[in-house]
């Protein structure tokens, strides 16, 4: 099956405090290789999630992500500051026959806008 | 440090069942997939099953399908692999293994050895 | 079926490698397995081809390409006379294969 990468919610809004799910399905797992998190794009992009083992203060992974059959990768993020706000990208990678693995595809993105937390 | 430790293990006769486990500590068990792997006397590695973190979806090689039955209990962190109807072929060493994010290992226990014999 | 060498051989000091064929690379993560005796316990060299655990040596390194993965220890000592089985997670069929095993003697 041709691999796509969907995030299905253009935009999200979340109150300042609270947690917000960002949504992210594959059509296919292959080629292998990791799904990663990033906020923003290009050089200056951040790395928020990998679902490759490594643990991130506030973000986790909604679905279990070590069924073989996973095509689920949306996370949760956490007590979300105003810092959080910005365009958040999933993006599928293949394994490279040397460092880096290869970016294959993006989903849309989704923006996050941070509400002042209601008084 | 991560530490998985097998039980269970033991002489049986043919047709017969065994049930082994594997109690594991040092690591968030809940958070990892699971497998079984075998080694029969003087034969290579052979994996058997394999179960997600949340124990809902479980994988088996072909020849131990329907007779092998894996498990996990993650308020013990404890692994299981339920084995019926045994035969001689089924004596090996048996493993369980912490599966990384790609489903390949990266700790193993020291095994437990099960010889089936009349 | 992975296939592997069934025993190589190196003086001390000495770069080994040692190869495992049969995976797709489209669809196959690699790793290495040390198993210093019969029926011991597996110590895992090296994982997702290239990855090496924080408490393995550096001596030991891995690389992945085409249809093949490559096991390479630079600089080999005596302890680490042991077989070594290649292990392949197919993303295609959710299947774990072995190679036999590579039994690395050191002179």
């Known amino acids: 099956k041709e691999l796509k990468v969907t995030q299905p919610e253009k935009s999200v809004s979340v109150a300042a405090g609270d947690s917000t799910v960002l949504n992210c399905t594959l059509t296919s797992l292959l080629p292998v290789g990791p799904i990663k998190w990033y906020r923003g794009v290009g050089q200056s992009r951040l790395l928020i999630y990998s679902f490759t083992g490594e643990h991130f203060p506030r973000v986790t992974n909604v679905s279990d992500a070590t069924k073989r059959n996973n095509m689920d990768f949306s996370i949760r993020i956490s007590n979300v500051t105003p810092e959080d706000a910005g365009t958040y990208y999933c993006v599928k990678f293949q394994k490279g026959p040397s460092e880096p693995d290869t970016e294959i595809q993006s989903g849309g993105g989704t923006e996050v806008y941070v509400l002042a937390k209601p008084s | 440090d991560v530490q998985l430790v097998e039980s269970g293990g033991g002489v049986v006769r043919p047709g017969e069942s065994l049930r082994l486990s594997c109690a594991a500590s040092?690591?968030?068990?809940?958070?990892?997939?699971m497998s079984w792997v075998r080694q029969a006397p003087g034969k290579g590695l052979e994996w058997l099953a394999g179960?997600?973190?949340?124990?809902?979806?479980?994988y088996y090689i072909d020849s131990v399908k329907g007779r092998f039955t894996i498990s996990r209990d993650n308020s013990k962190s404890s692994l299981y692999l339920r084995m019926n109807s045994l035969t001689a072929e089924d004596t090996a060493v048996y493993y369980c293994?912490?599966?990384?994010?790609?489903?390949?290992?990266?700790?193993w226990g020291l095994g437990t050895l099960v010889t089936v014999s009349s | 079926a992975l296939t592997q060498p069934a025993s190589v051989s190196a003086n001390p000091g000495e770069t080994v490698k040692i190869t495992c064929s049969g995976g797709?690379?489209?669809?196959?993560?690699y790793a290495w397995y040390q198993q210093k005796s019969p029926g011991s316990a597996p110590v895992t060299v090296i994982?997702?081809?290239?990855e090496r655990p924080s408490d393995i040596p550096s001596r030991f390194s891995g690389s992945a390409s085409g249809s093949a993965a490559t096991l390479i220890i630079t600089g080999v000592r005596v302890e680490d006379e042991a077989v070594y089985f290649c292990?392949?997670?197919?993303?295609?069929?959710?299947?774990?294969?072995f190679g036999a095993g590579t039994t690395l003697t050191v002179l």
């Open positions: 293994a912490r599966e990384t994010w790609n489903h390949l290992f990266d700790y």
């Open positions: 040092g690591f968030t068990f809940s958070s990892h997939a």
């Open positions: 179960i997600s973190a949340g124990g809902s979806d479980t």
């Open positions: 797709d690379y489209y669809s196959t993560y």
């Open positions: 994982h997702s081809d290239d």
């Open positions: 292990g392949g997670y197919d993303g295609r069929t959710y299947i774990n294969t």
